[in-house]
Amino acid sequence: PLATIPVSTTSLTSSEGSTISTPSVDISTPVTTSIVGDQCSRCKNGGFWDGLKCQCLTPYYGESCEEVVNSIDIAPPETVSAQMELTVTVTSVKFTDELKNHSSQEFREFNKTFTEQMNIVYSGIPEYVGVNITNLRLGSVVVEHDVLLRTKYTPEYKTALDNATEVVKQKITKVTTEQIMTNDNCSALMCFNTTGTQVQNITVTQYDPVEECRQKAEEYEDYFLVEYRDQKPYCISPCESGFNASKNCNHGKCQMSQNGARCLCVTTETHWYSGEDCNQGTQKSHHHHHH
């Protein structure tokens, strides 16, 4: 048998003007009852009974998962990164087959010197993390490598990483133009062939808080939006207070529905309130408006 659930009611008037009772369980929607032992519950919107209470799925909460939360946790990564695939030609080292073997003494030494050289080249770039050689091939030594960039997540992270990749291009172009062989010898840590410098590909971390917010809001995606506070994104509905997009319900309660946020106006002993924002008060005894 279906369990009977005590329903407490609050007298609220919708912004359209009719007085409605809002039960803690929405009895207008068919619900399934799951019975676990002696416990039984009506968990709606995909929620499930864990033996004590309903475990609700985002964006729902409440005893029966019938209410929509005002804010949804979104967690941008602490750091975001970019990877640049570059090729440079080192002329100050003669290629040998041992360089193909990443565990060889030759490769390890080349890797150390190349890393040291690139650390010098990119030393002024705060986003620079390091380089990773992916392949060495003949011609003097053609060095296929990744330049790794990282920065703290901010709303402008893409601009920061885009700017850093431009500086990387400028710096590698400069060093491979300046550090060249003279009379078949190199006076720098490493020398390069100017024409051998190429940027093959750039991959930037993709993180969109708006997209995460919309996905987590599910069928309420059109009504949740992202606002920033201290460079951190918040996924909120208009019913969340303290943000630019917050809905002011004055003498009422903000409630999310599938048509968006609406104000449920309260009725007190002396007044009833109406209007879209519950800001029109009518005194019960005298029937005149207070604005």
């Epitope: 100050s92 080292v93 003494q105 030494e109 010197t113």
Partner: nanobody, 124 residues
Framework: EVQLVESGGGVVQPGGSLRLSCAAS????????MAWFRQAPGKEREVVAF????????YYADSVKGRFTISHDNSKNTLYLQMNSLRAEDTAVYYC?????????????????WGQGTMVTVSS
């Protein structure tokens, strides 16, 4: 790990000769680079000569060309510097350097392995 030990330094009169030796150990290949650098008091370390042990390349600084000869004995893994017609300005600590790569750079920072150095004094 590569280790280098120099010998053969000493005091010699101008116009005299000396032969420096550098014994290398720890190499996994028989193709690598070896060099002689020197550092005079109050001056930067500078290249004297370098050689590829496969015989593919030798280099001499302009100041020693025609007077110094660099050579390598593969069977003994030893580098030599034959110094003739020595001058007062050749006085310095002479260092043996090595790389597992076939280097074409005269920048000391590019050479990862170093000996302790041997003193050469040219004085009358």
């Amino acid at each position: 790990e590569v280790q280098l030990v120099e010998s053969g330094g000493g005091v010699v009169q101008p116009g005299g000769s000396l032969r420096l030796s550098c014994a290398a150990s720890g190499y996994t290949s028989n193709r690598y680079s070896m060099a002689w650098f020197r550092q005079a008091p109050g001056k930067e370390r500078e290249v004297v000569a370098f050689i590829w042990t496969d015989g593919g390349r030798t280099y001499y600084a302009d100041s020693v060309k025609g007077r110094f000869t660099i050579s390598h004995d593969n069977s003994k893994n030893t580098l030599y510097l034959q110094m003739n017609s020595l001058r007062a300005e050749d006085t310095a600590v002479y260092y043996c350097a090595a790389s597992s790569l076939l280097l074409q750079t005269i920048n000391p920072r590019a050479w990862p392995y170093w000996g302790q150095g041997t003193m050469v004094t040219v004085s009358s």
